[in-house]
């Protein structure tokens, strides 16, 4: 059962796992959610009736029954982890805490103009978990405007105290706002010989990398595969760090793989969601339950639905035994990973999918694309929406992309002459325009947010957000697309598609079926040569064939230029403008979404 509200002046008795310090009960709830075993918590707020050494303590708790006895206590705030909830969760915390000093290892001290600058510094420093900034009103003259970057083993403060005229906050790496390099490669036959901060068991290097990514101290990792010569180290995932943040020594060793934390490219890859099955593999751990199940998929479902289950092993039924049902072993451990991994016993193992909601929804697998055709199939582009106007009569106006459960990203030029959001309708999960009838459900638009620097499509800033009146329930036919991460600015996308119901030639009509075209990106340099009379800025991106023939056209505006990278689709561009349609040496010009990620996050996360 999902309980989101906090219980004031209430303490949960017993069940303690560990105590951390957090600046608020809200953040305590997030920490509890991300902890592998925490189901409930009790936070102590600052209060005259409470011992100051207990202020800001966040006690993480577990219970076999998923609840604990409640006791009245002033200044205590209790609640439940979001593990029990189906909504998406994020570790992103942009709050600034006034007059609080969050203690940790102060490893860097420098002058900063503002708390925001200090937070940016923390976000762009590989070791930084949180910061404290002494404002210009700080009593001690030599400490004014000092920005202290801090880290701890857990990523949370070791203590929090009241201190006048300082502010504290967290790194925004988990908000995908870091400019740090994002290194996705996994290096075969490589061991990084730096200090280990932790070790866990993992079935493959990809899971090891994901564990490293959400471990607060891990910057890179080494994984020993099941063919590693030393038996006791097989499937061992070593989580590592170094002072520089980079591996200092790289040793060539067969059957080992190494790679980096993906903390700076976190929003465009699944980090918590280990969805694969591992055949002929047994995961060992504390047994939670043994249930009969028809298949390993059914076993995974059972694990996902049992809030305390972290991983499972399924042993298929012996012929005609137990109505063809096998045994499903639901398991857990202190850190969420198996305590040992065994091979050759015939089991099929995997992880709960409960944590998938901690990843951005946009990273989950979608239907494979049908290559070759120009007409799309249902569910192929589940983020694509058709935006209709109802005035003077109802018609398709523009395309758009779902980027959040209440947000559509589209082009600003679509709203020329649109006086009010009331005349707009957003239809999602649509393949054919003919599906849209009087009674077809749609999303009303609450607000149109146009970039305040927008004047006309050709001069840039052709970007707008639509805030929907109701939230989108994600399904296979309607789900979000990932925004490109700033850490991925230099990715060269080679698999890009433009989609829409727009014209197929300059003088044409809106198409019934959603059309798609694979189009190569063109450098801005090349694009500028094709548009001598315009300024192609870095906030624009171009795509098209030299010979023409495939392009976006009238009616596609606002729709996505979607590029697949590392198995995840990214919204690289928004269809904006071009000279004619599909003309030779006239590429289409798109809004370069990566340049607007900050603007998008600012608008969509505003309270």
């Amino acid at each position: 059962e999902c309980v989101t509200q906090l219980l004031k002046d209430t303490c949960f008795e017993g069940g303690d796992i560990t105590t951390v310090f957090t600046p608020s009960a809200k953040y305590c709830q997030v920490v509890c959610t991300y902890h592998p075993r925490c189901l409930l918590f009790t936070f102590t707020a600052e209060s005259p009736s409470e011992d100051p050494t207990r202020w800001f303590t966040c006690v993480l708790k577990d219970s076999v029954t998923e609840t604990l006895p409640r006791v009245n206590r002033t200044a205590a705030i209790s609640g439940y982890s979001f593990k029990q909830c189906s909504h998406q969760i994020s570790a992103c915390n942009k709050d600034i805490y006034v007059d609080l000093d969050m203690k940790g290892i102060n490893y860097n001290s420098s002058v900063a103009k503002s708390a925001q600058e200090c937070q940016e510094r923390c976000t762009d420093d590989v070791h930084c978990h949180f910061f404290t900034y002494a404002t210009r009103q700080f009593p001690s003259l030599e400490h004014r405007n000092i920005c202290l970057l801090k880290h701890t083993q857990t990523g949370t403060p070791t203590r929090i105290t009241k201190l006048d005229k300082v502010v504290s906050g967290f790194s925004l790496k988990s908000c995908a706002l870091s400019n740090l390099a994002c290194i996705r490669d996994i290096f075969p036959n490589t061991v990084f010989a730096d200090s280990n901060i932790d070790s866990v068991m993992a079935p493959d290097a990809f899971v090891c990398g994901r564990i490293c990514t959400h471990h607060p101290g891990c910057l890179f990792f080494t994984f020993f595969s099941q063919e590693w010569p030393k038996e006791s180290q097989r499937n061992l995932c070593l989580l590592k760090t170094s002072e520089s943040g980079l591996p200092s020594t790289r040793i060539k060793k067969s059957k080992a793989l190494s790679g980096f934390s993906l903390q700076s490219c976190r929003h465009s890859i699944p980090v918590f969601c280990h969805s694969s099955f591992y055949h002929d593999t047994d995961f060992l751990g504390e047994e939670l339950d043994i249930v009969a199940a028809k298949s390993h998929e059914a076993c995974q479902k059972l694990c996902t639905n049992a809030v305390r289950c972290q991983f499972f092993t399924y042993t298929p039924a012996q012929a005609s035994c137990n109505e063809g049902k096998g045994k499903c072993y639901l398991k857990l451990s202190s850190n969420g990973s198996p305590t040992k991994i065994l091979h050759g016993r015939g089991g099929i193992s995997g992880y709960t999918l409960r944590l998938c909601k901690m990843d951005n929804e946009c990273t989950t697998k979608i239907k494979p694309r049908i290559v070759g055709g120009t007409a799309s199939v249902r569910g192929e582009w589940p983020w694509q929406v058709t935006l209709h106007t109802t005035s003077p009569t109802q018609r398709h106006l523009c395309g758009g992309s779902i980027i959040g459960n209440q947000w559509i990203l589209t082009a600003a030029h679509c709203f020329y002459g649109v006086e009010s959001p009331k005349i707009l309708r957003v239809y999602s999960g649509i393949l054919n325009q003919s599906e849209i009838k009087e009674d077809t459900s749609f999303f009303g638009v609450q607000e149109i947010i146009i970039h305040d620097q927008y004047k006309m499509a050709e001069s840039g800033y052709d970007i707008a957000l639509l805030k929907l009146e109701t939230t989108v329930n994600y399904t296979d036919s309607q789900r979000p697309i990932c925004l490109p991460s700033k850490g991925d600015r230099n990715v060269i996308y080679t698999d890009c598609w433009v989609t829409g119901w727009g014209y197929r030639k300059l003088r044409d009509k809106i198409q019934n079926t959603l059309q798609k075209a694979k189009i190569p990106l063109v450098t801005n340099e090349e694009c500028q040569k094709r548009y001598r009379g315009h300024k192609i800025t870095h906030k624009m991106i171009c795509a098209g064939y030299r010979e023409g023939g495939k392009d976006a056209c009238k009616g596609d505006s606002g729709g996505p230029l979607s590029c697949k990278h590392n198995e995840v689709w990214h919204l690289v561009g928004i269809t904006s403008w071009g000279e004619g349609c599909a003309q030779r040496e006239r590429p289409g010009v798109y809004t370069n979404v990566v340049e607007y990620v900050d603007w998008i996050l600012e608008k969509t996360q505003a309270v």
């Epitope: 762009d124 870091s178 740090l180 290194i183 490669d185 910057l219 980079l246 591996p247």
Partner: nanobody
């Protein structure tokens, strides 16, 4: 003592090419972020391109993408910048820089070691 020495600058017509080199002593390019930065007359330092040798991840400023190519030769401990289709706005002093930590690749504030610079002049 760390020394980075740039060479290969000079004057060239618009549309021409140049190849800059940066030789390092006392610092290894291998396994560090290294990059090229430039400063045009009267302007601030701008990140041009960077490379992280492990896996060869490369990073470019939008203004040079498709025209400039960064590379390194670990055996010679030398960094290169091949500059094609040069434009007058590429005129600047080009600096080679080396970091000793994981950095935002094109952020000059985070690089520790710097060369003296080499002047590139592109005339129209």
């Amino acid at each position: 003592q760390v020394q980075l020495v740039e060479s290969g600058g000079g004057s060239v017509q618009a549309g021409g090419s140049l190849r800059l080199s940066c030789a390092a002593s006392g610092y290894t390019f291998n396994n560090n972020f290294v990059g090229w930065f430039r400063q045009a007359p009267g302007k601030g330092l701008e990140g041009v391109s960077a490379i992280y040798s492990l896996g060869g991840s490369t990073y470019y400023a939008d203004s040079v993408k498709g025209r400039f190519t960064i590379s390194q030769d670990n055996s010679k401990n030398t960094l290169y910048l091949q500059m094609n289709s040069l434009k007058p706005e590429d005129t600047a002093v080009y600096y080679c820089a080396g970091a000793i930590t994981w950095v935002p690749p094109l952020s000059h504030r985070r690089y520790t070691y710097w060369g003296q610079g080499t002047l590139v002049t592109v005339s129209s």
